[in-house]
């Protein structure tokens, strides 16, 4: 059949952050090449990464067409130099990936604190609304535009002079919290999608401390 020494891909794994989505698999090819296909439940399979010796394929362009659809990918293995050959069932060796629903499963990237402002006993912290690779009318959408009210943030903060932490939550990109006048605070934020069952939270942002250059500080 011509596929005697060809092995099927295995350990097919989705890696996705802010909808940038790559399929990875094993093994590193020896005398074989791979082609990837991706489909929604429509079964309209589209080929990508033709006859590649890589063990990853960027499928972002396909999944951002509709991030709420569920996708399946499959990786075909062909003998190097004989990509027309097929297996015993009349088609090339292939393996299916797990299903992947970008809206429910893409990791939310580490958030960034855009700015903070203190006015008296109020501290306003603004989280940068990062762009994703999802487009609408040719324009890249932000996380907020994609997730709407499904996306929230958790602020963890403490006085610079203390280790006792407090948290606050918001469904926007802004926090307004009560603070002690004249005190400096350190804080970080974490994105959260409470409705999810997996990948509910991002990693924490870098910690920002008041009085250390970044942000706007005023009495």
């Amino acid at each position: 059949s011509g596929t005697t020494n060809t092995v099927a891909a295995y350990n097919l794994t989705w890696k996705s952050t802010n909808f940038k989505t790559i399929l990875e698999w094993e093994p590193k090819p020896v005398n074989q090449v791979y082609t990837v296909q991706i489909s929604t439940k429509s079964g309209d399979w589209k080929s990508k990464c033709f006859y590649t010796t890589d063990t990853e394929c960027d499928l972002t362009d396909e999944i951002v067409k509709d991030v709420k659809q569920t996708y399946l990918a499959r990786v075909f293995s062909y003998p190097a130099g004989n990509v027309e050959s097929t297996g015993s069932a009349g088609e090339p060796l292939y393996e299916n990936s797990p299903e992947f629903t970008p809206y429910l499963e893409t990791n939310i990237g580490q958030p960034v604190i855009q700015k903070y402002e203190q006015g008296g006993t109020k501290l306003k912290v603004t989280v940068k609304d990062s762009f994703t690779l999802v487009r609408k009318n040719g324009t890249f959408l932000t996380l907020r535009q994609v997730f709407g009210n499904d996306l929230g943030y958790i602020l963890t903060y403490r006085k610079s002079s203390s280790s006792g932490k407090k948290t606050a939550k918001t469904n926007t990109n802004e926090f307004l919290i009560d603070v002690d006048k004249g005190e400096n605070y350190c804080f970080s934020v974490q994105a959260v999608i409470p409705s999810r069952t997996v990948n509910r939270k991002s990693t924490d942002s870098p910690v920002e401390c008041m009085g250390q250059e970044k942000g706007e500080f005023r009495e």
């Epitope: 929604t40 079964g43 309209d44 659809q69 015993s88 009349g90 299916n96």
Partner: antibody, heavy 118, light 106 residues
Framework: EVQLLESGGGLVQPGGSLRLSCAAS????????MGWVRQAPGKGLEWVST????????YYADSVKGRFTISRDNSKNTLYLQMNSLRAEDTAVYYC???????????WGKGTTVTVSS | DIQMTQSPSTLSASVGDRVTITCRAS??????LAWYQQKPGKAPKLLIY???SLESGVPSRFSGSGSGTEFTLTISSLQPDDFATYYC????????FGGGTKVEIK
């Protein structure tokens, strides 16, 4: 509620033709591959054909290749099976099924009976 | 084509019994297997897909296991509604069904 309703079955002579239809409701029809599966009297299930959501990809069992044609009209939420050059061994209940990725069948119609006999 | 062989073809059991049906593929199909239940005069009903994923609305007494070439459908405690014929189906390469296993009252 997701529903599939087949029609068009009946008695036909060997060599004759028949067109089966399957009306779908309760889901976005174009989002799913669809298929036909048949069951001869007292026998097991036999896959016949599958079509992708756009209609651009079609697959057939060897036993019907060249004689049967699967198609769909997404504007009418309807799946079709055109059966030509019918043989006695095509006698069966024909089921229409919703088939995610064209792989397995998660919703089935009640079936329509095709009898090929002189 | 990949052949699917089910055993036994008929199985006699009583309500409350633990029932196991086996399906063997003629070559490896990884986990790309579904199980269906069919009652006389009715359409088949999906129970399990991807070898072990329970379809929504299917009672938890049904479970599937296996990968490669050997698979099992288990009914942990047979109920009166479970007397039916069960089919496996591979979808690794096109689609083929097993010959069926009839579960009848002992």
């Amino acid at each position: 509620e997701v529903q599939l309703l087949e029609s068009g079955g009946g008695l036909v002579q060997p060599g004759g033709s028949l067109r089966l239809s399957c009306a779908a409701s309760g889901f976005t029809f174009s989002d799913y591959a669809m298929g036909w599966v048949r069951q001869a009297p007292g026998k097991g299930l036999e896959w016949v054909s599958t079509i992708s959501g756009s209609g651009g990809l079609t697959y057939y069992a060897d036993s019907v290749k060249g004689r049967f044609t699967i198609s769909r009209d997404n504007s009418k939420n309807t799946l079709y099976l055109q059966m030509n050059s019918l043989r006695a061994e095509d006698t069966a209940v024909y089921y229409c099924a919703k088939a995610p990725y064209g792989y397995y069948m998660d919703v089935w119609g009640k079936g329509t009976t095709v009898t090929v006999s002189s | 084509d990949i052949q699917m062989t089910q055993s036994p073809s008929t199985l006699s059991a009583s309500v409350g019994d633990r029932v196991t049906i086996t399906c063997r593929a003629s070559q490896s199909i990884s986990s790309w297997l579904a199980w269906y239940q069919q009652k006389p005069g009715k359409a088949p009903k999906l129970l399990i897909y991807k070898a072990s994923s329970l379809e929504s609305g299917v009672p938890s007494r049904f479970s599937g296991s296996g990968s490669g070439t050997e698979f099992t459908l288990t009914i942990s405690s047979l109920q009166p509604d479970d007397f039916a014929t069960y089919y496996c189906q591979q979808y690794k390469s096109y689609i083929t069904f097993g010959g069926g296993t009839k579960v009848e009252i002992k």
